[in-house]
Amino acid sequence: VVGVEEASVDSWPWQVSIQYDKQHVCGGSILDPHWVLTAAHCFRKHTDVFNWKVRAGSDKLGSFPSLAVAKIIIIEFNPMYPKDNDIALMKLQFPLTFSGTVRPICLPFFDEELTPATPLWIIGWGFTKQNGGKMSDILLQASVQVIDSTRCNADDAYQGEVTEKMMCAGIPEGGVDTCQGDSGGPLMYQSDQWHVVGIVSWGYGCGGPSTPGVYTKVSAYLNWIYNVWKAEL
């Protein structure tokens, strides 16, 4: 996360680190004792479940036990819109035990469409600079807002690449954004409860003023999530 402050896992108990061969690859969000929500592109290189592990319950990357993964379910790839459908569900081998530092985040209600300038939060262990060095060892957080998709698709920005199944978030002047290593983590909105409204997906650089972060819009995939759950009951 670029333009940030340190976070405590008490504040974001649904945040997990998704690791391959003990290396942090992506963030993710706990939805219930069995399921973690993340981005499909995290698994482009490796889809085998055996070397993937989930770490929950700590704000420090290396300091918490790893959980075995039973299944990785990725939505169908759409070659017409290769950046669309960047969503995946990980089923854990054993259910999580919830505590002060391990808790689920809510899915949005089906009519939750957020207006531009709505305040949101991002978190992650990703790079803190665009051309950036390394992952952060500690969980970082930042406040952003919904950026109007018309503005996001402007000629000096993403030129129409942001589809209706995506959303943009950042701050108008830039400087606050998700970055490499934050992928799969939640874009969060607080109403009565915290909701995961977006999944860290893609962007050009990190923190540029005209190219904010682009997120998978979770409300666009509720049906897919519910169908996966139903099929896995």
Epitope: F109, E113, D192, K217, S219
Partner: antibody
């Protein structure tokens, strides 16, 4: 003012198809999920289908799954219901309704499936 | 699917008197986000339905304050404190917590 106007209803034979439209005005259409609800003659209300504001997620009642398709065109402020393989039991007044609370309704359009 | 059961089927009321309609769901309507998406709709004869109450007890804009909603979990009630002639029609409860969305069978309010 906020308004929903349905059209496209009519008489169709069993097995036939029909496409209903709902024109929305007076609000930011893309910010709202939309639903279709139907009411058979002399009967209660039955939810048919819903679609999220982006059009990304669609939901259906079991009675219409695989036969009906909900869609929307946010650039035109239009909601659609494509109805295929129509049956006599699909005969009803079809309403479109706004949002997760169904807070605005159209006047409805009548679909009659009969030979 | 969540089954919504309304009672009574019909409620003959004297003008100016209260009326009460009950709605019971086959499972809890509390969404994972903590909200309870239970709405009440009114359908006057020959008209489309109209939203009265959402999230158990919130009155929709323009709805007279003689209408009130209450309840929690699986048991909900719509009350009309003093029935007026324009209140005649069928009242439906509906849950929007879980797909498929489902309605109660309706309660007909008529004047004695």
């Amino acid at each position: 003012q906020v308004q929903l106007v349905e059209s496209g209803g009519g008489l169709v034979q069993p097995g036939g198809s029909l496409r209903l439209s709902c024109a929305a005005s007076g609000f930011t259409f893309s910010s709202y999920a939309m639903s279709w609800v139907r009411q058979a003659p002399g009967k209660g209300l039955e939810w048919v289908s819903a679609i999220t504001g982006s059009g990304g997620s669609t939901f259906y009642a079991d009675s219409v799954k695989g036969r009906f398709t909900i869609s929307r065109d946010n650039s035109k402020n239009m909601l659609y219901l494509q109805m295929n393989s129509l049956r006599a039991e699909d005969t009803a007044v079809y309403y479109c309704a706004r949002g997760g609370n169904l807070d605005v309704w159209g006047l409805g359009t009548t679909v009659t499936v009969s030979s | 699917d969540i089954v919504m059961t309304q009672t009574p089927l019909s409620s003959p009321v004297t003008l100016g008197q209260p009326a009460s309609i009950s709605c019971r769901s086959s499972q809890s309507l509390v969404h994972s986000n903590g909200n309870t998406y239970l709405t009440w709709l009114q359908q006057r004869p020959g008209q489309p339905p109209r939203l009265l109450i959402y999230k158990i007890s919130k009155r929709f804009s323009g709805v007279p304050d003689r209408f009130s909603g209450s309840g929690a979990g699986t048991d909900f009630t719509l009350k009309i404190s003093r029935v007026e002639a324009e209140d005649v029609g069928v009242y439906y409860c509906m849950q929007l917590t879980q797909f498929p969305l489902t309605f109660g069978g309706g309660t007909k309010v008529e004047i004695k």
